[in-house]
């Protein structure tokens, strides 16, 4: 047998060489077309396992879009035809709760999760006899990477004199549940940086195949939480990085989500974008925002893909994406996942399993309506999956998809065998579909969530609610004391109330100046490299949030450290959630908060509010009877009609759907 090259096994402490045996038909020599289903016999540690594989239909589509750039920096859009892709998922015969994510493109490569061990398999280089290396994932050498600063590092920091023991915490009741009842769909967009592209020999096809493989691995990990990963886009920075990647992980993450909001969202709708970087951050494997998966401005993460295998890298991306999905680190909590360490452990452990805590954190996100964007099954033109009736994704050419024949028995509107609507059905799913019929125009389908949001209504001829819009960023709110920012009125009192209860309010400005000038974990203007930044006096109102009149202590499933600083006759309260430096701190002042006359917080600096590009003269444009929405169209008050609120009508905008139903005035909001 061929011996593996040093490069191939240098990261393994133990491995075996095996020859998988294909059960279904003779092993093909030609790489395409790939079978929809295939089975192999695989040997591992003296045992033979029969594995059954099925092409992962939910993963990728007809119009898989890949964005690249030419030498002039012009965006190129490509739709490579990869319907008959070679990425599979499956199970090990006779092994309860087993799962497999493999590609069968040029030999078998991927992950096998058995009851108490995970194995990696890959083709043996230069073998002409279909030989493969199989190894336990525990036997892969890994650099001691962490998701930012580990919790222990934070605890080691010098205790502050002012720090107080918080009042006793109410323990949240824990319900152990591995799988949440309703399937959620994460529409994932991956961006690959220039250095990683160069590292892959500037081979766009190789990058694309590797990222599809990664998405397949992610899907195999998330399925235990009843979450499906659907890759909706890939962008490769072939001509140079489009953001500044100099600085700390926090700086790069901030730059990336700003670029995403400005350039990527408009091109391709998605729930979370993950940047894949070659450059490391001194032991930090990645960084992401917590609970922001549906946010326009913060649904992103960065992930370091250096000299590690894609199998190991998958657990890093699963971890950072987990943060977006509301999952905190497992460290210091009573969590179990049936393995030595779990995916949301702060040290990048290469684990494949989510813990009970992760399931609970994600459930909390969904209960708090933070995961509403995950309910939609990706539309046919948005999902990169080879169309297949029965995968519960409405693919191109399908009108509905109710899943398996058993599931379809419960669906009155969809013909399971054809994925077409039954003849009497107008629709089968969607916020504006009820009992197989379109809800009447004027039915509220997405209510107003704050004074900076606007409602949306069904239009009477579609199963979908109108796209979500809100009041244009920069519009005054809270009696001119604040500005609207991404659908929320951002002001200090409200932020204090979220953390410290309904009686709390912002502390005086002196508190912010005194605490945030210190540059420690309780008072800072962000994180750069390995240290906290002190706030200049002019930026102090954009650092750590300072509150007073605190009567409740927060419980977010993770016990925070609370600091109380006496200042000029009051007590300033601040909080550190100790989430690790791979997670932006929810105890900081929110972006978009008004920090002075005509000024807002951005990137922990108090800058001119003109950066919000608010350009709506409501008197001229909306005749004083409405406001501009995020599409820069008038949303009229009840009594006035769009588009310009000039004539009598029933309110709303060209974007909101009709606010009124002639037949049924009870539908008015």
């Amino acid at each position: 047998a061929a011996r593996p090259g040093f490069q191939q096994t240098s990261h393994l402490s133990s491995y075996e060489i095996i020859t998988p045996w294909r059960l279904t038909r003779e092993r093909r020599e030609a790489p395409r077309p790939y079978s929809k289903q295939v089975s192999y016999v695989i040997q591992a540690e003296g045992k033979e396992h029969i594995i059954h594989l099925e092409r992962n239909k939910d993963l990728l589509p007809e119009d898989f879009v890949v964005y690249t750039y030419n030498k002039e920096g012009t965006l190129i859009t490509d739709h490579p035809n990869i319907q008959n892709h070679c990425h599979y998922r499956g199970y090990v015969e006779g092994v309860h709760n087993s799962s497999i994510a493999l590609s069968d493109c040029f030999g078998l490569r991927g992950l096998l999760h058995l009851e108490n061990a995970s194995y990696g398999i890959e083709p043996l280089q230069n073998s002409s006899h279909f030989e493969h290396i199989i190894y336990r994932m525990d036997d892969v050498y890994k650099e001691p990477l962490k998701c930012g600063v580990s919790n222990k590092d934070i605890e080691k920091e010098t205790a502050k004199d002012e720090e107080e023991e918080p009042p006793s915490m109410t323990q949240l009741l824990r319900r152990r549940r591995a799988v949440l009842p309703q399937t959620r769909y994460v529409e994932l967009f991956i961006v690959v940086d220039k250095e990683r592209y160069d590292m892959m020999g500037r081979n766009q096809t190789a990058v694309r195949e590797e990222m599809i493989l990664l998405a397949n691995y992610l899907d195999s990990m998330y399925i235990m939480l009843n979450i499906r990963i659907v890759l909706v886009g890939l962008e490769i920075w072939t001509n140079g990085n489009l953001i500044n990647i100099v600085g700390g992980a926090g700086d790069v993450l901030g730059n990336f989500v700003q670029w995403r909001e400005k350039f990527l969202i408009t091109r391709r709708r998605h729930d979370s974008a993950q940047l894949v970087l070659k450059k490391g951050f001194g032991g930090t494997a990645g960084m992401a925002f917590v609970g922001t998966v549906c946010s326009r401005s913060h649904a992103g993460g960065i992930n370091v893909f250096g000299q590690i295998t894609v199998e190991t890298f998958a657990s890093i991306v699963a971890h950072e994406l987990g943060h977006n999905l509301g999952m905190n680190h497992d460290d210091g909590r009573d969590c179990s996942c049936g393995a030595k360490s779990c995916i949301m452990n702060s040290g990048a452990s290469g684990s494949r399993n989510f813990s009970s805590c992760s399931a609970e954190d994600f459930e909390k996100l969904t209960l708090n309506k933070g995961g509403n964007c995950l309910l939609n099954i990706p539309k046919p033109d948005e999902a990169y999956s080879a169309p297949s009736c029965g995968n519960k994704l409405v693919d191109a050419g399908e009108e509905c998809d109710c899943g398996t024949p058993k599931e379809c028995e419960l669906d009155p509107c969809c013909e399971g065998s054809t994925c077409k609507l039954k003849s009497f059905a107008e629709c089968a799913y969607g916020d504006c579909c009820k009992d197989c019929r379109f809800l009447p125009g004027g039915t509220l389908c997405r209510g107003k969530t704050s004074e900076c949001d606007v409602p949306e209504y069904c239009n009477g001829s579609s199963q979908f609610c109108q796209p979500d819009v809100f009041i244009q960023n920069g519009y005054p709110c809270q009696n001119n004391k604040a500005y609207c920012y991404n659908g929320m009125c951002q002001y200090y009192d409200a932020q204090c109330q979220v953390i410290f209860g309904s009686k709390a309010k912002a502390a005086p400005k002196d508190c912010f100046i005194e605490v945030n000038s210190k540059g420690d974990r309780f008072g800072n203007c962000g994180f750069s490299g390995n240290e906290y930044k002190k706030c200049a006096t002019g930026n102090a109102l954009c650092g750590k949030l300072q509150c007073e009149n605190v009567q409740e202590i927060p419980v977010f499933g993770i016990v925070p450290a609370i600091i109380q600083t006496p200042s000029r006759g009051t007590k300033c309260w601040g909080v550190d959630f100790q989430l690790g430096s791979d997670v932006p701190d929810p105890g900081m002042v929110n972006e978009g908060t008004k920090c002075g006359a005509g000024k807002i917080c951005r990137n922990f600096q108090c800058v001119d509010a003109s950066v919000l590009n608010y350009d709506c003269d409501v008197q001229k444009k909306c005749h004083g009877h409405g406001v501009c929405n995020s599409n820069k169209n008038c949303h009229c008050e009840n009594g006035w009609a769009p588009p310009n609120c000039e004539t009598k009508g029933y309110g709303g905008s060209v974007d909101s759907g009709p606010t009124y139903n002639e037949m049924n005035t009870a539908l008015r909001d």
């Epitope: 009108e399 003849s423 107008e426």
Partner: nanobody, 124 residues
Framework: EVQLVESGGGLVQAGISLKLSCTAS????????MGWFRQAPGKEREFVAG????????AYTDSVKGRFTISRDNAKNTVYLQMNDVKPEDTAVWYC?????????????????WGQGTQVTVSS
């Protein structure tokens, strides 16, 4: 090839009842959805009521709910529209249509077969 023939129309006074019939011939209507449409002079054809051939599913436009009832008799290959308390605005040519595909009830292109129509005139 399925043929649909409407009957039961005519000149009636407001407030009385009327029953329209639609009889199908030339094919089986299993899994079809049968719809009644009206087209008033100078207006677009609009969906009024529908019934599934093989289930109890019925649908009505809001303006006729509680006033009209759609039913079917599979043995006679016929669909009925019972119109109570007719109003002058019900004056129109009434059409029967059949479709095998799902989608919006007012998407006329989804219907495979149409009858010739029957005139209903309601005088006040």
């Amino acid at each position: 090839e399925v043929q649909l023939v409407e009957s039961g129309g005519g000149l009636v006074q407001a407030g009385i009842s009327l029953k329209l019939s639609c009889t199908a011939s030339g094919g089986t209507l299993t899994n079809y959805f049968m719809g009644w449409f009206r087209q008033a002079p100078g207006k677009e054809r609009e969906f009024v009521a529908g019934v599934a051939w093989s289930s109890d599913f019925t649908a009505y436009t809001d303006s006729v709910k509680g006033r009209f009832t759609i039913s079917r008799d599979n043995a006679k290959n016929t669909v009925y529209l019972q119109m109570n308390d007719v109003k002058p605005e019900d004056t129109a040519v009434w059409y029967c249509a059949a479709r095998r595909r799902g989608g919006g009830y007012n998407q006329l292109n989804l219907y495979d077969y149409w009858g010739q129509g029957t005139q209903v005139t309601v005088s006040s």
